[in-house]
């Protein structure tokens, strides 16, 4: 289970994101800064600092709007 305000690294971070974001998917860096394979974004925030549920949710992808 997700424990609020902790550090999450490696696979544990990925699995938690998958749980929080569900079918929406997620980005390793926020969409505003483009999806990138660079070691910044959520890894820096959640593994090397700490993160909570609200921060994790900001990395979820927004589902495409159906017309």
């Amino acid at each position: 289970a997700y424990r609020p305000s902790e550090t999450l690294c490696g696979g544990e971070l990925v699995d938690t994101l998958q749980f929080v974001c569900g079918d929406r998917g997620f980005y390793f860096s926020r969409p505003a800064s483009r999806v990138s394979r660079r070691s910044r974004g959520i890894v820096e925030e959640c593994c090397f600092r700490s993160c909570d549920l609200a921060l994790l949710e900001t990395y979820c992808a927004t589902p495409a709007k159906s017309e």
Epitope: G10, G11, S39, R40, E44, F48
Partner: antibody, heavy 120, light 107 residues
């Protein structure tokens, strides 16, 4: 060619200090998490420390916390490990390694290692 | 911390043999498991990441499988250059821990 080259190892007395360097080439150093991994003589591998790409945040193994400091200079493509209050159990080959952060956190590039011997 | 164990700790085999090494984690790590090969006096080299993904340039005789707590590295037909020590490493959570190693020597 992707390469990491460590330097700075040597013989030091217990309680002493040493600074290791790792020069990176062949990849965009500033984009990757980097780490130090060590191996005591005849023993297995032990993760020591990691540093985020920007250099602003770090992680340490409990065995070195408060004694070792990892840092990096992205303008020089160089990773450092400052080792203080050294103990006999810190004797090991120290490797710097590049972290495949979004592909399973494996260490996909390693240096040749530098030997640190702590002895009186 | 997650503890990693390997079996056997050492084994002897002949060129052409099929060899299997097992790695176990003290808790579930999904498929966040990497395998390394290390030859004497050399740095480790990653063979497989994410339990089963072969690294670029690694011969296809190496394969990995498993999930949760039990993983295997298989060499389908042992070659002379394969004799070395093999380590597993979990990348599920920090500290990223390694197994104690399996030394593969010539029979």
């Amino acid at each position: 060619e992707v390469q990491l080259l460590e330097s700075g190892g040597g013989l030091v007395q217990p309680g002493g200090s040493l600074r290791l360097s790792c020069a990176a080439s062949g990849f965009t150093f500033s984009e990757y998490v980097m780490a130090w991994v060590r191996q005591a003589p005849g023993k297995g591998l032990e993760w020591v420390s990691s540093i985020v790409s920007s250099g602003g945040y770090t992680k340490y193994a409990d065995s070195v916390k408060g004694r070792f400091t990892i840092s990096r200079d992205n303008s020089k493509n160089t990773l450092y490990l400052q080792m203080n209050s050294l103990r006999a159990e810190d004797t090991a080959v120290y490797y710097c390694a590049k972290d495949m952060t979004y592909s399973g956190d494996a260490f996909d590039v390693w240096g040749q290692g530098t030997m640190v011997t702590v002895s009186s | 911390d997650i503890q990693m164990t390997q079996s056997p700790s050492s084994l002897s085999a002949s060129v052409g043999d099929r060899v299997t090494i097992t790695c176990r984690a003290s808790q579930s790590i999904n498929t966040y498991l990497n395998w390394y090969q290390q030859k004497p006096g050399k740095a480790p080299k990653v063979l497989i990441h994410a339990a089963s993904t072969l690294e670029s340039g690694v011969p296809s005789r190496f394969s990995g499988s498993g999930s949760a707590t039990e993983f295997t590295l298989t060499i389908s037909s042992l070659q002379p250059e394969d004799f070395a020590t093999f380590y597993c490493q979990q990348s599920y959570s920090v500290p990223f821990t390694f197994g104690p190693g399996t030394r593969l020597s010539s029979k």
